[in-house]
Amino acid sequence: MMTGTIETTGNISAEKGGSIILQCHLSSTTAQVTQVNWEQQDQLLAICNADLGWHISPSFKDRVAPGPGLGLTLQSLTVNDTGEYFCIYHTYPDGTYTGRIFLEVLESSVAEHGARFQIP
C-alpha cells in the first residue's frame, strides 16, 4: 500500500528574467527513492538517479541547475516557462509518487508586488 505523501514548494508566481527553485519532499513512507524525474508538459527536464546522480536534458542545460537536494533551479525565466511542473518519485517498493507545481512567469508590465523573483 502506498502511504507516502508529496509536499511541494507550492505554486509560484515569478517575474521574467528571475530564477526560482522547485522542490518536492516525500514523507510518511519508508520506501527507498530510486530516482526523481522533473517534467514539464511531457518534456523531461532532469533526472536525479540514486546511483548515477543528475542528468539535465540537453535542451535545458543552460537554464536548469540541479538542486538544492532533489529540487531543481530554473534560471533566466521566460514567459514560455509558464506551466505545470511535475516531480515524479520512483520508489521501491511503493511505486511512483507525483507532485505538481504550477509556475507562472509574468512580464514585468503585468508583474506586481507579490510575484517573487531572484536575480541569478
Epitope: 507550492g10 505554486n11 508566481s13 508538459q41 509558464t82 505545470e84 505538481r100 507562472e104 503585468v110
Partner: antibody, heavy 117, light 112 residues
C-alpha cells in the same frame, strides 16, 4: 475594459460532446492564464483546469481529466472547453475566468449546460 | 487536494452590521517564497463571481474599503464592516497555492 464573452446555453443529449467558447477582449490574451470553473446545483465551485494561451500548456484537476479538453485560438483571443461523453452529472453552469497570480480577476457570464434525453 | 472549510454556512444579517467569514485550509497556504495565494469572491444571484480580496488582504480595484481580509498559514478571515444591500450573496474563499486550486463551500449572506 476587460471582457470575457461566453457562448450561449446548451441542451444536449447524454453521451454526446459539446464545446463552450470564451472570447477575451480588452487585454493581452497571452499574458494571463484562462481558467475554467464548474458550478453545480447553484452552489459548489470546482476548478476544472487552465490553459496558458502563450504556449498552449494546460493543467487539469484530475477529477476532470478525460472529461474536459482545453484549447485556445490566439488569433481570435478565444479559449475553448470541450466536454466529452456527457451525463446528467455534467449539467451545471461553466465559467471561464482570467487568472493572474492564482486568483481570478475577471469572469465570463457563465454558460448553462443541461444534459437530458 | 487541499480542503477549504468555510464557516458559517449561512449568515443572517441586518443592514449596517459588521460580519466575519472564516476560511480554514487543510494545509498551510504559504509557498516556499512566503506568498499566500488566498482570495475571496462574492457571487450574487444571476451574476458571475467577482473578486474581492487577493493575497490574503489586498482589495481588488473598485472594491469598497468596508471589505478587508486577514490571516496566515491555514486560518483566514473576510470582514465586512457595514453591510449594504449589494453585499448579499454567496461568499467563497479560494486557495491557489497548491494544485489543484480549491474553493471553500461558500457562506450565504442573507437578510434576517
Amino acid at each position: 475594459e476587460v471582457q470575457l464573452q461566453q457562448s450561449g446555453p446548451e441542451l444536449v443529449k447524454p453521451g454526446t460532446s459539446m464545446k463552450i467558447s470564451c472570447k477575451a477582449s480588452g487585454y493581452s490574451f497571452t499574458g494571463y492564464t484562462m481558467n475554467w470553473v464548474k458550478q453545480s446545483h447553484g452552489k459548489n465551485l470546482e476548478w476544472i483546469g487552465l490553459i496558458v494561451p502563450y504556449n498552449g500548456g494546460t493543467s487539469y484537476n484530475q477529477k476532470f481529466k478525460g472529461k474536459a479538453t482545453l484549447t485556445v485560438d490566439k488569433s481570435s483571443s478565444t479559449a475553448y472547453m470541450e466536454l466529452l461523453s456527457l451525463t446528467s452529472e455534467d449539467s451545471a453552469v461553466y465559467y471561464c475566468a482570467r487568472g493572474l497570480s492564482f486568483r481570478y480577476d475577471y469572469w465570463g457570464q457563465g454558460t448553462t449546460l443541461t444534459v437530458s434525453s | 487536494d487541499v480542503v477549504m472549510t468555510q464557516s458559517p454556512l449561512s449568515l443572517p444579517v441586518s443592514f449596517g452590521d459588521q460580519v466575519s467569514i472564516s476560511c480554514r485550509s487543510s494545509q498551510s497556504l504559504a509557498n516556499s517564497y512566503g506568498d499566500t495565494f488566498l482570495s475571496w469572491y462574492l457571487h450574487k444571484p444571476g451574476q458571475s463571481p467577482q473578486l474581492l480580496i487577493y493575497g490574503i488582504s489586498n482589495r481588488f480595484s473598485g472594491v469598497p474599503d468596508r471589505f478587508s481580509g486577514s490571516g496566515s498559514g491555514t486560518d483566514f478571515t473576510l470582514k465586512i464592516s457595514t453591510i449594504k444591500p449589494e453585499d448579499l450573496g454567496m461568499y467563497y474563499c479560494l486557495q491557489g497555492t497548491h494544485q489543484p486550486p480549491t474553493f471553500g463551500g461558500g457562506t450565504k449572506l442573507e437578510i434576517k
